[in-house]
Interface confidence: low
């Protein structure tokens, strides 16, 4: 059972003699008189299992110590850190020929984890280890231990595991700790990409290319890659990931936007506060919901404030000129927070008797500059009927008006066009013809263009050809023309008059008076 000791994050320990509870039980050859397992106390009064040998008086020493089998866990290169004390031969009297100040370090790769014996010829020498000047002094009760640390590496390894061996050739040594580890580039997150634990390459100069995977709630911008160096350090980050919409980078993670914040796109931006007149009630919002009564147009960016339809235009003024109307108005008090305001004109023709009975004006009416999408606050409307009630509505609209179910952004005005001269009378009839009189009747003009004040009948003898004519005026749509000559052809014209003047005369009606006293009844346009 091994206790936990803290080592750098880029080192993975395969063996640590200091962490083993109880005896190490490594194999020594010879079994007696060579390496011996000895417990000492370290500076914290914790027992340490050490291996010691000190056969400095005797020549030709060849004492071997072999570890248990060590799994390589996929590592191709491993490091051996040895902490040891080694006595200076000068401090030992009478050992000049036999005392050594080095020992040898060996390894042997094997798939067999239960080899019981040391076969020296199987082992490959890693190095000769000597004590250098760099030692640490460790207080072990009444003594000070001069502790040397040496690190060697070996590789490439290919079998499942290996054994280490220490050969003493006549030194006075205590192996205080043996640690075997390999180096990895530890799991890391760089540019929002996670790079897994990666074992370093086989040789000391190799770089292992590693592809990263985007952290949760992120996506690749450029393929994230890094290189794992032989010393367990990550090098040369390439590419990156970006937090998804609704998420931002916090502490190397893509975390959901907080309530009241949003992020619309996968970018490296942080979440933004909801724009004015909008809100988000859940974490991870990609857009903010508009407050009630506020809207976002289809082409509005998520970063734009929510806006409203405009209020009604103000100060609508009308100016009637015969059958034309000029309208002018002021911009609404509230544009709804938008710049794209325009105006639409609605024209309704309303009955004089019942203004509620209005109908669209139809295509005969013309608008200058246009009827819909006006950018100016004035419009001229022409080709209206004279003496007619019209209601004009001016609607203020903007990019979100179509989303408003209850529009109230219009202002209206009702006007009556001026009277004009009436149109001509289409049909004049001779209802009765006698020797001395003609009874005429006619229809009202198609377009009275006002109140008909009177009708004027002009008549003359046909052969006089209008050189000498007479006029009769009447408010009715019929009249008796008396005092005519018998058996004479007369030509009759009728026209109507309003306050604006006379209309055109009707087409001529030719009638010939009778010679006999009896009456002739006629209804044609040309009675004879």
């Amino acid at each position: 059972v091994t206790g936990s000791r803290v080592y750098p994050a880029n080192e993975v320990t395969l063996l640590d003699s200091r962490s083993v509870q109880g005896e190490l039980g490594w194999i020594a050859s010879p079994l007696e008189g060579g390496w011996e397992e000895v417990s000492i106390m370290d500076e914290k009064n914790t027992p340490i299992r050490t291996y010691q040998v000190c056969n400095v008086m005797e020549p030709s020493q060849n004492n071997w110590l072999r570890t248990d089998w060590i799994t390589r866990e996929g590592a191709q290169r491993v490091y051996i850190e040895i902490k040891f004390t080694l006595r200076d031969c000068n401090s030992l009297p009478g050992v000049m020929g036999t005392c050594k100040e080095t020992f040898n370090l060996y390894y042997y790769e094997s798939d067999n984890d239960k080899e019981r014996f040391i076969r020296e010829n199987q082992f490959v020498k890693i190095d000769t280890i000597a004590a250098d000047e760099s030692f640490t002094q460790v207080d072990i009760g009444d003594r000070i231990m001069k502790l040397n640390t040496e690190i060697r590496d070996v590789g490439p390894l290919s079998k499942k595991g290996f054994y280490l061996a220490f050969q003493d050739v006549g030194a006075c040594i205590a192996l205080v700790s043996v640690r075997v580890f390999y180096k990895k580039c530890p799991l890391t997150v760089r540019n929002l990409a996670q790079f897994p634990d990666t074992i370093t390459g086989a040789d000391t100069s190799s770089l292992v290319e590693v592809r990263g995977s985007c952290v949760n709630n992120s996506e690749e911008k450029d393929v994230p890659k890094m290189y794992c160096g032989a010393d367990g350090e990550w090098l040369v980050p390439i590419g990156n990931c970006l937090c998804n919409a609704g998420h931002e980078e916090r502490s190397g993670e893509c975390q959901a936007c907080k309530i009241g914040y949003y992020k619309a796109l996968s970018t490296d931006a942080t979440c933004a506060k909801c724009p004015p007149h909008s809100y988000s009630v859940w974490e991870g919002a990609t857009s903010c919901t508009c407050d009630r009564g506020f809207f976002r147009a289809d082409n509005d960016a998520a970063s734009m404030p929510c806006t409203r339809p405009p209020s009604a235009p103000l100060n609508l003024i009308s100016n009637v000129n015969e059958t034309s109307v000029n309208l002018e108005w002021s911009s609404p008090q509230n544009t709804g927070g938008r710049q794209d305001i325009s105006y639409n004109v609605v024209c309704k023709k309303c009955g004089a008797g019942d203004p509620s009975k209005c109908r669209p004006c139809g295509s005969g009416v013309h608008y200058t500059p246009q009827q819909n999408g006006l950018k100016t606050t004035k419009v001229s409307i022409t080709d209206l009927l004279a003496h007619t009630n019209y209601t004009f509505e001016i609607w203020a609209v903007n990019g979100v008006s179509k989303y408003n179910p209850n529009p109230d952004q219009s202002v209206s005005v009702t006007v009556t066009t001026n009277q004009a001269a009436p149109s001509s009378i289409a049909l004049v009839q001779a209802k009765e013809v006698t020797r001395y009189s003609v009874a005429l009747a006619w229809l009202e003009p198609d377009r009275p263009n006002g109140v008909i004040l009177e009708y004027e009948v002009k008549y003359y003898e046909k052969d006089q050809n209008e050189r000498s004519y007479r006029i009769v005026r009447t408010a009715a749509r019929n009249t008796d023309i008396k005092g005519l000559n018998p058996l004479t052809s007369y030509v009759f014209h009728v026209r109507a008059r309003t306050a604006a003047g006379y209309g055109d005369f009707s087409e001529p009606l030719e009638v010939t008076t009778n010679t006999v006293p009896s009456r002739i009844i006629g209804d044609g346009a040309n009675s004879t």
Partner: antibody, heavy 124, light 107 residues
């Protein structure tokens, strides 16, 4: 003034159903979501979930999925909690409480108005 | 789910005492916390929201503080009508759990 008035106490047998009402007045019903909170005898408060008064969509806390149903009748500004297959452990006071459905600036939530509570006793 | 741990579960105090109740969330709730007062047989009443904001009509002797995971409700000078049970509640990701309550009794 703003009020949530709940229906009266109920005594039910195990296996029966009960429907608790919560009538809102003094504000626009659909402007606030309605939440339900349970308090077992001598115990603390436990949030059961809520109903969106505009869409009618309910959300249930994990412990209240299955036998508990939230519903509405917006025409009378009333929210309902129905519990079916009643068990003795459903004995509790049930409260309704409101939270604004729309937020105009503040991102902090709280139950500002509570019903007076309806005691449901389940006993054979 | 976020757990809300209130302490103490009960306390005895006298009129005029300064009383402090703490509420600890199992993770950062970013000040999304409300405090309620409940008297026997009555519905809870809102005291504070957003950890520190006093609700309408609540006396100024009640105050709140805290951020992250640790929050405090303080009654600066306990009045007879303040003897009740107090609950904290978080609003940071559903379910919105309450603390188990702190009963303030007369000493």
């Amino acid at each position: 003034q703003v009020q949530l008035v709940q229906s009266g106490s109920e005594l039910k047998k195990p296996g029966a159903s009960v429907k608790v009402s919560c009538k809102a007045s003094g504000y626009t019903f659909t402007d606030y979501s309605m939440h339900w909170v349970r308090q077992a005898p001598g115990q603390g408060l436990k949030w059961m979930g809520w109903i969106n008064t505009e869409t009618g969509e309910p959300t249930y806390a994990d412990d209240f999925k299955g036998r508990f149903v939230f519903s509405l009748d917006t025409s009378v500004s009333t929210a309902y909690l129905q519990i079916s297959s009643l068990k003795a452990e459903d004995t509790a006071v049930y409260y309704c409480a409101r939270i604004p459905l729309y937020y105009y600036g503040s991102r902090y939530w709280y139950f500002d108005v509570w019903g007076q509570g309806t005691t449901v006793t389940v006993s054979s | 789910d976020i757990q809300m741990t209130q302490s103490p579960s009960s306390l005895s105090a006298s009129v005029g005492d300064r009383v402090t109740i703490t509420c600890r969330a199992s993770e950062n709730i970013y000040r999304n916390l409300a405090w309620y007062q409940q008297k026997p047989g009555k519905a809870p009443q809102l005291l504070l929201y957003a950890a520190t904001n006093l609700a309408d009509g609540v006396p100024s002797r009640f105050s709140g503080s805290g951020s992250g995971t640790d929050y405090t409700l303080t009654i600066s000078s306990l009045q007879p009508e303040d003897f009740a049970t107090y609950y904290c509640q978080h609003f940071w990701g559903t379910p919105w759990t309450f603390g188990q309550g702190t009963k303030v009794e007369i000493k």
